[in-house]
């Protein structure tokens, strides 16, 4: 079998959901000494980066300008050290948002419920879409999907304090083209005093996987980056559409 280098890690900087006409930035974290990085879109070459000097950085950032539906889809990257190529990274799904219209999100029986109550979110959009998506802030990888002509429902079942947080929904025109986000709906779940006080609150920052951890080479940083690359490859989870 042909020898290959370890696969790089591909990430979206900040978020994989990019408003149309805004810039997306994808990071490909490979190896110190890589002389070339390639970004592929839907299996075809999209961009090439040849860092100079190559030994100083363990990855590159690819800017994707003017986001639109033609640039939304599945990206991957590879890198080369000398004449040796890496395996292909996992696929990253890049989504364009703020397409066409804005849905309305509501919750039944209401935004304030007690632990154990059954809750259902309703997302409504009066334009031609049949797929709806519900996201919880700080958990943008955990997308719930539902189908309906102009409205979809998202039954949550009996909720716990872990369900507390801010939710938004989108209408989806295809897997990679989403509407404007709805206005957020904040779900407040009250339980007994002990549970409520101990329940962790969700972070409002994006997923920790959506950050670029590129480092310049120093002795310590090289060790940390190697550890980070190994750990991330081991634990990396990716949402597939």
């Amino acid at each position: 079998p042909k020898q290959t280098l370890p696969k790089p890690i591909i990430r979206a900087e900040s978020t994989y959901m990019v408003p149309k006409e805004k810039q997306a930035t994808l990071c490909c974290q490979g190896s110190y000494g890589a002389v070339e990085y390639q970004l592929h879109f839907e299996g075809s070459l999209f961009a090439v980066e040849r860092p100079k000097p190559p030994e100083r950085i363990n990855g590159v950032k690819f800017h994707i300008p003017d986001m639109n539906s033609r640039k939304a889809g599945r990206y991957s990257c590879i890198y080369r050290v000398g004449e040796l190529w890496s395996e292909r990274s996992d696929l990253l799904d890049l989504v364009v948002t703020e397409m066409y219209d804005t849905p309305t999100l509501s919750v039944h029986p209401g935004p304030e419920v007690t632990s154990g109550e059954k809750v259902t979110f309703y997302c409504r959009l009066d334009t031609a879409t049949s797929m709806f998506l519900l996201l919880k802030e700080g958990r943008s990888r955990d997308v719930q999907r539902s189908y309906g002509k102009v409205q979809a429902e998202f039954p949550m079942g009996p909720v716990t304090t872990a369900h507390r947080g801010s939710y938004r929904c989108f209408g989806s025109y295809n897997n990679y083209a989403w509407s404007f986000p709805s206005e957020p709906v904040k779900l407040l779940v009250t339980g007994d005093i002990e549970n409520t006080s101990l329940a962790p609150t969700d972070p409002t920052f994006p997923d920790s996987w959506d950050t670029c951890l590129l480092t310049r080479e120093t002795g310590l940083q090289k060790d940390l980056a190697l550890w980070d690359h190994t750990a991330q490859n081991h634990h990396h989870h990716h949402h597939h559409h």
């Epitope: 999209f46 961009a47 980066e49 590159v60 950032k61 800017h63 994707i64 640039k71």
Partner: nanobody, 130 residues
Framework: DVQLVESGGGLVQAGDSLRLSCAVS????????MGWFRQGPGKDREFVAA????????YYADSVKGRFFISRDNAKNTAYLQMNNLRLEDTAVYYC???????????????????????WGQGTLVTVSS
Amino acid sequence: DVQLVESGGGLVQAGDSLRLSCAVSGRTFSRLPMGWFRQGPGKDREFVAAISWSSSTTYYADSVKGRFFISRDNAKNTAYLQMNNLRLEDTAVYYCAAVGGSLDYSATVVYTAARAYADWGQGTLVTVSS
């Protein structure tokens, strides 16, 4: 608005050389990655060559590697495509293109996908005869 104007096309014999120029106005040319594409008769548009804004990275389609050379003069807001040892299959309309946005692009990045480019010239016809 951005204008890209190609020139230098024409009718040549197989084995001859030709140099295409692409004059850009309306944007900060010196910070834009650039590319050349072509569309032959009855064919899809295909990537030919690309160059980073600093000229430090160039990239070529396999079919033109070793024969075509892309360059740029940021002082003149112009990109060039030097085409040597032309073949019959190089007959096409050649387009230059500039990557969109107003980003601080890396000095070493090139874009090979047509969808990455926002602004296009009107094209110049290159015909190679035997």
